[in-house]
């Protein structure tokens, strides 16, 4: 009785269960009652990452420097190449097919998380007591100057974009 289902790492072809090709190899010819599945290793620039019956290996991803990409991890016969972005850039998607410059946090916002090759800068609004007066991809919100510790008084209140202005205390004569 011909099988209707096959074991793990097998596939059904013309009423016969054949072994799948292991990762790193492609299918050349299905098995027969007398011959095992014919598989061939993928070439140097190709890969297959699963047990498969593919007749063609997949081409390794190309990390195009014109798109700001560089190789993070070279591909093998069983894994794809992993791309990342050059310094100052990050991926536009999870598959990292192109790069864009990291965004800067505008005045009034500070860097919560510095960008990496795969993630953009995360900004946060400066809370009360903190400010940022620059557009930066690295600088966090800075605390207002403490006038008291300098024996000074606040002459101008701080905002999320400006520091407080300290001045001398009024002395009574």
């Amino acid at each position: 009785e011909p099988p209707t289902a096959c074991r793990e790492k097998q596939y059904l072809i013309n009423s016969q269960c054949c072994s799948l090709c292991q990762p790193g190899q492609k299918l050349v010819s299905d098995c027969t009652e007398f011959t095992e599945t014919e598989c061939l290793p993928c070439s140097e620039s190709e890969f297959l990452d699963t047990w498969n019956r593919e007749t063609r290996c997949h081409q390794h991803k190309y990390c195009d420097p014109n798109l700001g990409l560089q190789v993070q991890q070279k591909g093998t016969s069983e894994t794809d190449t992993i791309c990342t972005c050059e310094e100052g850039l990050h991926c536009t998607s999870e598959s990292c097919e192109s790069c864009v410059p990291h965004r800067s946090c505008l005045p009034g916002f500070g860097v919560k998380q510095i960008a990496t090759g795969v993630s953009d800068t995360i900004c946060e609004p400066c809370p009360v007591g903190f400010f940022s007066n620059v557009s930066s991809a690295f600088e966090k919100c800075r605390p207002w100057t403490s006038c008291e510790t300098k024996d000074l008084v606040v002459q101008q209140a701080g905002t999320n974009k400006t520091d407080v202005v300290c001045g001398p205390q009024d002395r009574q004569r």
């Epitope: 013309n14 010819s29 299905d30 098995c31 027969t32 009652e33 007398f34 011959t35 095992e36 014919e38």
Partner: antibody, heavy 117, light 109 residues
Framework: QVQLVESGGGVVQPGRSLRLSCAAS????????MHWVRQAPGKGLEWVAV????????YYADSVKGRFTISRDNSKNTLYLQMNSLRAEDTAVYYC??????????WGQGTMVTVSS | EIVLTQSPGTLSLSPGERATLSCRAS???????LAWYQQKPGQAPRLLIY???SLATGIPDRFSGSGSGTDFTLTISRLEPEDFAVYYC??????????FGGGTKVEIK
């Protein structure tokens, strides 16, 4: 390169025995089923026998069943055909061929067996 | 047993002409497991077509196969001098035995 080379043919009297060999090279012999196919002088191709890659399954043509035995030694990359009780009608060129789902994709050059008194 | 009948027995043609060879099976050939082989005098057969219509490795594309069930055809679009030979069909779906057709000889007219 992928190659099959038959040997062991010759002239033999009716009723006698002969053993043919087929030496394989250039491929993983132990993964492939193997066939013997013969061709009588001036005639067409006749399938004789097949053996599975590990040697457990064997099938024969009715014309040779009980007289011929197909076997293999994977450690020597060699296929055999033991031919007993030979008859005049067994006179032919004997080819070994590789089994695939694409048919017989590789053939040897053949070895001539003549059964004559 | 599947009996394969090839026709014609002999085909006389000139180089550059089209050759059409027929192979008829006594019962349906499952999965189109039918192959075509070429054999020249003193040589072993050579696989041309498998699965009724797939071209074997290294075979020129002037050779093509078609058909399913019980009727199969080998076509040589433009005969080259080296194509004059004997052609055999073979079924490998229902066995034992693996059966061959009687052959078609393509000769120079």
């Amino acid at each position: 390169q992928v190659q099959l080379v038959e040997s062991g043919g010759g002239v033999v009297q009716p009723g006698r025995s002969l053993r043919l060999s087929c030496a394989a090279s250039g491929f993983t012999f132990e993964k492939y089923g193997m066939h013997w196919v013969r061709q009588a002088p001036g005639k067409g191709l006749e399938w004789v026998a097949v053996i599975s890659y590990e040697g457990t399954k064997k099938y024969y043509a009715d014309s040779v069943k009980g007289r011929f035995t197909i076997s293999r030694d994977n450690s020597k990359n060699t296929l055999y055909l033991q031919m007993n009780s030979l008859r005049a009608e067994d006179t032919a060129v004997y080819y070994c061929a590789r089994d695939t789902s694409r048919g017989h994709d590789i053939w040897g050059q053949g070895t001539m067996v003549t059964v004559s008194s | 047993e599947i009996v394969l009948t090839q026709s014609p027995g002999t085909l006389s043609l000139s180089p550059g002409e089209r050759a059409t060879l027929s192979c008829r099976a006594s019962q349906s050939v499952s999965y189109s497991y039918l192959a075509w082989y070429q054999q020249k005098p003193g040589q072993a057969p050579r696989l041309l077509i498998y699965g009724a219509s797939s071209l074997a490795t290294g075979i020129p594309d002037r050779f093509s196969g078609s058909g399913s069930g019980t009727d199969f055809t080998l076509t040589i679009s433009r005969l080259e001098p080296e194509d004059f030979a004997v052609y055999y069909c073979q079924q490998y779906s229902d066995y034992p035995p693996f059966t061959f057709g009687g052959g078609t000889k393509v000769e120079i007219k």
